[in-house]
């Protein structure tokens, strides 16, 4: 297993609709054809997996159908979007990148993006 540098923004504020997007960029030492991207959430020293996708270079990322993540890739960059976020989901979202094929296997883990989320104000009652 060889180490690889992964860069991501330090802080992102989610939209009022609970959507946050950020780029995860990795310094690929070779010509990987198969890449796995995993998003981990760290909150109060607990780490949980948010979503993961394996893709072939030049193809779209495909997350599971019920995943809250979507993404696109371009070269050594992965543009990740996390949807359905609530205030309670505020936390550090860490991008983990694995170069699966061809060997050697490389692993890189970013410092994390702190995603801040605020629940939208409830709409005032209106009479029709």
């Amino acid at each position: 297993c060889k180490a690889m540098h992964v860069a991501q923004p330090a802080v992102v504020l989610a939209s009022s609709r609970g959507i946050a997007s950020f780029v995860c960029e990795y310094a690929s030492p070779g010509k990987a054809t198969e890449v796995r991207v995993t998003v981990l959430r760290q909150a109060d020293s607990q780490v949980t997996e948010v979503c993961a996708a394996t893709y072939m270079m030049g193809n779209e990322l495909t997350f599971l159908d019920d995943s809250i993540c979507t993404g696109t890739s371009s070269g050594n960059q992965v543009n990740l979007t996390i949807q359905g976020l609530r205030a309670m989901d505020t936390g550090l979202y860490i991008c983990k990148v694995e170069l699966m094929y061809p060997p050697p296997y490389y692993l890189g883990i970013g410092n994390g993006t702190q995603i801040y989320v605020i629940d939208p104000e409830p709409c005032p009652d209106s009479d029709f």
């Epitope: 802080v11 009022s16 205030a87 702190q114 801040y116």
Partner: antibody, heavy 117, light 107 residues
Framework: QVQLVQSGPEVKKPGASVKVSCKAS????????IGWVRQAPGQGLEWMGW????????NYVQKFQGRVTMTTDPSTSTAYMALRSLRSDDTAVYYC??????????WGQGTLVTVSS | EIVLTQSPDFQSVTPKEKVTITCRAS??????LHWYQQKPDQSPKLLIK???QSFSGVPSRFSGSGSGTDFTLTINSLEAEDAATYYC?????????FGPGTKVDIK
Amino acid sequence: QVQLVQSGPEVKKPGASVKVSCKASGYTFTNYGIGWVRQAPGQGLEWMGWISAYNGNTNYVQKFQGRVTMTTDPSTSTAYMALRSLRSDDTAVYYCARVGASGVDYWGQGTLVTVSS
Amino acid sequence: EIVLTQSPDFQSVTPKEKVTITCRASQSIGSSLHWYQQKPDQSPKLLIKYASQSFSGVPSRFSGSGSGTDFTLTINSLEAEDAATYYCHQSSSLPFTFGPGTKVDIK
């Protein structure tokens, strides 16, 4: 090293608007946010809101909603805070501060805004 | 919004004495509590992040502890240059908030 340099002092009449700038250097501007904090004479720190320089999303404290606008210009690594309909109790030192994973870490030197007729 | 309360409001201390300032949050904020020092006519400066982590360049006499709702800033062996107002700040949830401050002066 990280530096935030703010625009100079302003004197405004009640009802007017003010726009304070904050130029950042020493880090990748779009990787962080910029928050705005004010401090009335002899008082404590009051959080006003912040903007994510990464995507331009903003979060304002309800008290300032509708009266404040925070923007960024990534091409010059500068953040702006505009406050409208100024009142005498808006007289304060306005600070910009970098928002990182651990809340606010680095601060500007402050801009004194005086509202007086 | 999360309300932070600090105690005491004011403390007059002799040099080399130990100073303890407490900050209480209106609801649990984990360890997302940070401490700042502000001297007269200066900007605040970060001392402690995430309840107990010293910020770069901060003297070792400053330390922090706590989690959840109760937090403490300790200044071991106070020096004359430590005369300032100390604020706690939470970044657990938006909007961010500050405590009202604790003024420390030297006897």
